[in-house]
């Protein structure tokens, strides 16, 4: 008789989750020489230990500390690119501009990107049927707590000029409830970070709006300036041209505004 299982509102653990995490770890450590010392089996054990046999609505940042310790990584603190609701373009950018890093370009971010996972209280099973939804079920679930933890650490490590890519097609270009708005903004260290520079990405049709004057960007600037961090903003009117110009900066069409 199958044991009763809690039904959550969110999708279950990504299929082949353990194999995926292990394979990603191996691939990452092969590509990044500075992380070759990492033992991927230990990383998986620490990852698993953060949520297995624990109630998936009662996960804490402390649960992830062994994993954080194993995944400790130094990225150039002045080359950090944060993003909100525009992950694909941010990743395309750092694939071209190799000296800049999103969270998903770090080992821990790379391991978990686009994956879902959760366990069950008092059993060693992974729940492949459903996992808690942040809104409908609980915020202290394994996935949300993981991203909150790594995002906080990533923001805390930043220095000098920090860039953030924002989606100008959304009704809230800056959303206080996003990971960027609720975690990263508040964990930038004013004694290390001089400026936060927002890149607002225009979508769809060409338009001449100045999205740096969007009310939510003004709100972001207000929050940032109260933390004694300077703020600047650029419109990226044509993201396709923007990427092209990152690839080929000497192109004659790249001198004009993008």
């Amino acid at each position: 008789v199958p044991r009763w299982r809690q039904q959550w509102s969110g999708p279950g653990t990504t299929k082949r989750f353990p194999e995926t995490v292990l394979a990603r770890c191996v691939k990452y450590t092969e590509i990044h020489p500075e992380m070759r010392h990492v033992d991927c089996q230990s990383v998986w054990d620490a990852f698993k230990g953060a949520f297995i046999s624990k109630h998936p609505c009662n996960i804490t940042e402390e649960d992830y500390q062994p994993l954080m310790k194993l995944g400790t990584q130094t990225v150039p603190c002045n080359k950090i690119l944060l993003w909100s609701r525009i992950k694909d373009l941010a990743h395309q950018f750092t694939q071209v501009q190799r000296d800049m890093f999103t969270l998903e370009d770090t080992l821990l971010g790379y391991l978990a990107d686009d994956l879902t996972w959760c366990g069950e209280f008092n059993t060693s099973k992974i729940n492949y049927q459903s996992c808690p939804d942040w809104r409908k079920d609980c915020s202290n679930n394994p996935v949300s707590v993981f991203w909150k933890t790594v995002s906080r650490r990533f923001a805390e490590a930043a220095c000098d000029v920090v860039h953030v890519m924002l989606n100008g097609s959304r009704s809230k270009i800056f959303d206080k409830n996003s990971t960027f708005g609720s975690v990263e903004v508040h964990n930038l260290q004013p004694e290390k970070v001089q400026t936060l520079e927002a890149w607002v990405i225009h979508g769809g049709r060409e338009d001449s709006r100045d999205l740096c004057q969007d009310p939510t960007i003004k709100e972001l600037e207000s929050i940032i300036s109260k933390r004694n961090i300077q703020f600047s903003c650029k419109n990226i009117y044509r993201p396709d041209k923007f990427l092209q110009c990152v690839k080929n900066p000497e192109d004659s069409s790249c001198t004009s505004e993008i």
């Epitope: 001449s208 740096c212 969007d214 009310p215 003004k218 300036s225 703020f231 903003c233």
Partner: antibody
Framework: EVQLLESGGGLVQPGGSLRLSCAAS????????MNWVRQAPGKGLEWVST????????YYADSVKGRFTISRDNSKNTLYLQMNSLRAEDTAVYYC?????????????WGQGTTVTVSS | QSVLTQPPSASGTPGQRVTISCSGS????????VYWYQQVPGTAPKLLIY???QRPSGVPDRFSGSKSGTSASLAISGLQSDDEADYYC???????????FGGGTKLTVL
């Protein structure tokens, strides 16, 4: 009561300089973008400059670019306009105005203006 | 000459409805919100309409704004003598990278 009070206007010779101030009260100055708008005698309104909350974003009209500098001191709740290389065509009433809350380009509170006369 | 074109004058009798137009281009009116200001001679301008058609609190519903393509309009119904003033449209111009005003329309209540 929300108030903006401009000062610093006066008579100045062409090529001279002047610094306008705008003292804000009745609202949290450090939460708002601020603007300078001018009006030549018998003419319409002309936008001059805009500054963001922290001063990290600044815009100027082409007619004043390179000659005027907008700045703010949030600790003193004051907006400034440094005007250099003044010309006769800069003669106008200069208004400071705050941006409308939760808006793009609207200016919902205006001062009464200070008069700048450029003449030899 | 202003980037936004307004008729220099308009007039109407008390109780009448008058409309003031504001014509621009894709880089200003079409792509951006339009604002309307009222300026009684000798006083500072007052925000009348924001974000194309929104009224700040305290502005009577006799005033309404609309926008279509590269043109915007301010309509005043039930005209009153104290509506006699200069009216300005304003927006952002992406080509000029700045805020712009129309030349203004002097409204006379006959």
């Amino acid at each position: 009561e929300v108030q903006l009070l401009e000062s610093g206007g006066g008579l100045v010779q062409p090529g001279g300089s002047l610094r306008l101030s705008c003292a804000a009260s009745g609202f949290t100055f450090s939460d708002y973008w601020m603007n300078w708008v001018r009006q030549a005698p018998g003419k319409g309104l002309e936008w001059v400059s805009t500054i963001s909350i922290s001063g990290g974003i600044i815009y100027y009209a082409d007619s004043v670019k390179g000659r005027f500098t907008i700045s703010r001191d949030n600790s003193k709740n004051t907006l400034y306009l440094q005007m250099n290389s003044l010309r006769a065509e800069d003669t106008a009433v200069y208004y400071c105005a705050k941006d409308n809350w939760n808006d793009y380009y609207g200016m919902d509170v205006w001062g009464q203006g200070t008069t700048v006369t450029v003449s030899s | 000459q202003s980037v936004l074109t307004q008729p220099p004058s308009a007039s109407g009798t008390p109780g009448q409805r008058v409309t003031i137009s504001c014509s621009g281009s894709t880089s200003n009116i079409r792509d951006n919100y339009v604002y309307w200001y009222q300026q009684v001679p000798g006083t500072a301008p007052k925000l009348l309409i924001y974000k194309d058609d929104q009224r700040p609190s305290g502005v009577p519903d006799r005033f309404s704004g609309s926008k279509s393509g590269t043109s915007a309009s301010l309509a005043i119904s039930g005209l009153q003598s104290d509506d006699e003033a200069d009216y300005y449209c304003a927006t952002w111009d992406g080509s000029l990278n700045g805020r712009v005003f129309g030349g203004g329309t002097k409204l006379t209540v006959l």
